[in-house]
């Protein structure tokens, strides 16, 4: 898009660039022990490493701003990793009324790009 | 969402905390005053500063992330500010026929939040 | 409706390695907290939890099991499926797959399939 | 692994009466979120089991109100208020608490 062309390979080394890894967490971890009952560990996959010029953009804002990083680098921060799409995830919880199963679409992260 | 409150003042002082902050740029700043022809200035919305903990979260995966990153910061990012929404921008450029009139969806930022 | 259908061979000879898929359809394998999960039956017996995998491709063994279980997941397909390795007679048995929150809350089964271990 | 014991083996019943089933752990089930990781499963004849309560004492979305599972710890019990016909096949306890969940042997039900 906008003469601007987002690149997939990273320029820094494998495992660098923003990708996405899974982390293991307790319900204790997220401070949710008092709440969800299952499951008691959560594979979480979030997005992780750098952004550099042009790799994985999500869109023409973050190819401008990977511009304007590499020419005022104090005022324009570089883009950053964050998640593109997300999976959801089945928690069994405690409700006023007893116990639920509720799907959250916005918790564990899919895809990722740099904003 | 979850537990967890995202909150909306900022505790590093004013200003330090993710925000909206426009940037002017020319269209040689962008690299694009071969296809732009108006506007030759533009000013360009961008989010950018801290995210610390809850502060402005997006959803409930940065609600984790900021938690996860207290516990474990070598391994998880904090939470970093991207746009939530943006405006839509006009720009005339050069096409093969001649000049035509293009709306951009994503080149401007309008709100931010921490993701 | 979330359903599960179970598929592979009936017959498998001693210390070959008995293969099982499970298809998954009206729902995405891709969910996080769900464990898809096999447990088997023997022949007029008792119900045991053979293992189980998450959509991220962690897996879970009943360490009874462990050194000769395989559970992979293909998302693309929504499969998963239970590789058990030299088997023998005692590995004679209905297989189930199911869908579990962690290691409870089996609330869809597979029909099961009959698994018969001889020369 | 924990091991699951049930009583009795075998409950013939009469259509219409109560019917209690007694699940036992090796060690308590009671984590301490306050709730008792113990499911119920009935397995009707030449069917795949299906889940009846979960956390002890709740019941399975579509599951009739005449089944209620309580006891807490180690003790567990199955209760079916009034028995229908189609309430016959084997039920199993399954204790969740910890990997690998284990299941008891299994109460037979059926009608006198």
């Known amino acids: 898009s906008a003469h601007l062309h987002p690149r997939d390979s990273c320029p820094l080394g494998p495992g660098r660039c923003c990708h996405l890894e899974t982390v293991q967490a307790t319900l204790e971890d997220l401070g949710w022990s008092d709440w969800v009952l299952s499951p008691r560990q959560l594979q979480l996959s979030m997005c992780v490493g750098e952004c550099p010029h042009l790799y994985r953009s999500a869109n023409t804002h973050a190819l401008i701003k990977a511009r304007l990083h590499g020419l005022q680098p104090d005022r324009v921060p570089a883009p950053c990793c964050v998640p593109s799409s997300y999976t959801p995830v089945v928690l069994m919880h405690r409700t006023d009324s007893g116990v639920s199963l509720q799907t959250y679409d916005d918790l564990v992260a899919q895809g990722c790009h740099c904003a | 969402s979850a537990h967890l409150h995202p909150r909306d003042s900022c505790p590093l002082g004013p200003g330090r905390c993710c925000h909206l902050e426009t940037v002017q740029a020319t269209l040689e700043d962008l690299g694009w005053s071969d296809w732009v022809l108006s506007p030759r200035q533009l000013q360009l919305s961008m989010c950018v500063g801290e995210c610390p903990h809850l502060y402005r979260s997006a959803n409930t995966h940065a609600l984790i992330k900021a938690r996860l990153h207290g516990l474990q910061p070598d391994r998880v990012p904090a939470p970093c500010c991207v746009p939530s929404s943006y405006t839509p921008v006009v720009l005339m450029h050069r096409t093969d026929s001649g000049v035509s009139l293009q709306t951009y969806d994503d080149l401007v930022a309008q709100g931010c939040h921490c993701a | 409706q979330v359903q599960l259908q179970e598929s592979g061979p009936g017959l498998v000879k001693p210390s070959q390695t008995l293969s099982l898929t499970c298809t998954v359809s009206?729902?995405?394998?891709?969910?996080?907290?769900?464990?898809w999960t096999w447990i088997r039956q023997h022949p007029g017996k008792g119900l045991e939890w053979i293992g189980a995998?998450?959509?991220?491709?962690?897996?879970y063994y009943n360490p009874s099991l462990k050194s000769r279980v395989t559970i992979s997941v293909d998302t693309s397909k929504n499969q998963f499926s239970l590789k058990l390795s030299s088997v023998t007679a005692a590995d004679t048995a209905v297989y189930y797959c199911a869908r579990g929150i962690e290691y409870q809350h089996f609330d869809y089964w597979g029909q099961g399939t009959l698994v018969t271990v001889s020369s | 692994d924990i091991v699951m014991t049930q009583s009795p083996l075998s409950l013939p019943v009469t259509p219409g009466e109560p019917a209690s089933i007694s699940c036992r752990s090796s060690?308590?089930?009671?984590?301490?979120?306050?709730?008792?990781?113990l499911d119920w499963y009935l397995q009707k004849p030449g069917q795949s089991p299906q889940l009846l309560i979960y956390l002890g004492s709740n019941r399975a979305s579509g599951v009739p109100d005449r089944f209620s599972g309580s006891g807490s710890g180690t003790d567990f019990t199955l209760k079916i208020s009034r028995v229908e016909a189609e309430d016959v096949g084997v039920y199993y306890c399954?204790?969740?608490?910890?990997?690998?969940?284990?299941f008891g042997g299994g109460t037979k039900v059926e009608i006198k």
């Open positions: 009206g729902g995405s394998i891709s969910s996080g907290g769900i464990y």
């Open positions: 399954m204790q969740t608490l910890e990997a690998p969940p284990t």
């Open positions: 060690q308590s089930l009671l984590h301490s979120n306050g709730y008792n990781y």
């Open positions: 995998i998450a959509y991220s491709g962690s897996t």
